[in-house]
Interface confidence: low
């Protein structure tokens, strides 16, 4: 069973001139999942992201999340990788407030 | 600072069941999941199993039948039992902690502690 | 299950030269899932490298790590002599979750 996860990516503000932005990956199975945000499409230090675990998310698929802090107008240059049982695909953050992407394979 | 220690008998007699426990500090076993290998003597490193923060567990098929891994979250220990051991499961046995973000690499390692199975 | 075989064995250098440590997988692994550890006798395996080619906090940069697909590679730029270990890579992309055999880099 393959189950592709939906990639939710938003944004919230942080100190002056920085902005969070997080990318959430839910409803997905198996559980093994690659989350990662890019710079200018190269993966950020894994000092620089923080990462949730992958936990159940009570409908027999998993949920997990990836987030880093960024400078606010540079929005453009990061994306979210994802890469789930042999396929991937990347987010961007979005201008508004959310951004909902459903992977199509 | 993040510390694994790996306690339990260090002479189990065949076909008993070897039980260890890796006690863990500087974390905490809800947020981090928890590896077990062993290297058997002079030889390569083994994946046993781990358990995930949600007590989920993945084992390796060679090891399926006999092993179990289990987790107290109130004592941050998780422990591995594998049973039915012959002179084949004598090795030093590792726990390790599942790195976050590292893909599930195994960031930290206890020192090890050596099993032999012998009668 | 994914075999990863490590080569050479053994590597015999001098402090100061390159060492370039092969592991070839049987299957393609996402790089994602490929990582490097080092032991040293008596020791726990200590991670060095996850995901193909980040490098741990406070691992020097003499070492690092590349490849895709099915082959990759760990490099020491310039062996000191605390070096010296047995290298192991290891795949997390499938179930079981196997190490190669190991390379021993000892002192020439």
């Known amino acids: 069973r393959r189950v592709p996860p939906m990639v939710n990516v938003t944004r919230s503000e942080a100190s002056e001139g920085n902005i969070t932005v997080t990318c959430r990956a839910s409803s997905f199975y198996p559980r093994n999942i690659t989350l990662t945000w890019r710079q200018d499409g190269v993966s950020l230090s894994h000092d620089t992201q923080q990462w949730g675990d992958v936990l159940p998310d009570g409908n027999g698929t998993y949920q997990t999340w990836v987030a880093t802090r960024i400078c606010q107008g540079e929005e453009q240059r990061f994306t979210c990788y994802m890469e789930h049982s042999g396929n991937h695909s990347t987010h961007p953050v979005p201008s508004g407030k959310v951004l909902v992407l459903q992977s199509h394979w | 600072q993040v510390q694994l220690q790996e306690s339990g008998p260090g002479l189990v007699k065949p076909s008993e069941t070897l039980s260890l426990t890796c006690t863990v500090s500087g974390f905490s076993l809800t947020t981090y999941g928890g590896h077990w290998i062993r290297q058997p003597p002079g030889k390569g490193l083994e994946w046993i199993g781990m358990i995930w923060t949600d007590g989920w567990t993945d084992y390796n098929a060679a090891f399926i039948s006999r092993v179990t891994i289990s987790v107290d979250t109130s004592k941050n220990q998780f422990s591995l039992k594998l049973s039915s051991v012959t002179a084949a499961d004598t090795a030093v046995y590792y726990c390790a902690r599942k790195g976050h973000g590292y893909y599930y690499a195994m960031d930290y390692w206890g020192q090890g502690t050596l099993v032999t199975v012998s009668s | 299950e994914i075999v990863l075989t490590q080569s050479p064995g053994t590597l015999s250098l001098s402090p100061g030269e390159r060492a370039t440590l092969s592991c070839t997988a049987s299957s393609s692994v996402s790089s994602s899932y490929l990582h490097w550890y080092q032991q040293k006798p008596g020791q726990a395996p200590r991670l060095l490298i996850y995901s193909t080619s980040n490098l741990i906090s406070g691992i020097p940069d003499r070492f690092s790590g590349s490849g895709s697909g099915t082959d990759f590679t760990l490099t020491i730029s310039r062996l000191e002599p605390e070096d010296f270990a047995v290298y192991y890579c290891?795949?997390?992309?499938?179930?079981?979750?196997?190490f190669g055999q190991g390379t021993k880099l000892e002192i020439k």
């Open positions: 290891h795949q997390y992309h499938r179930s079981p979750f196997t």
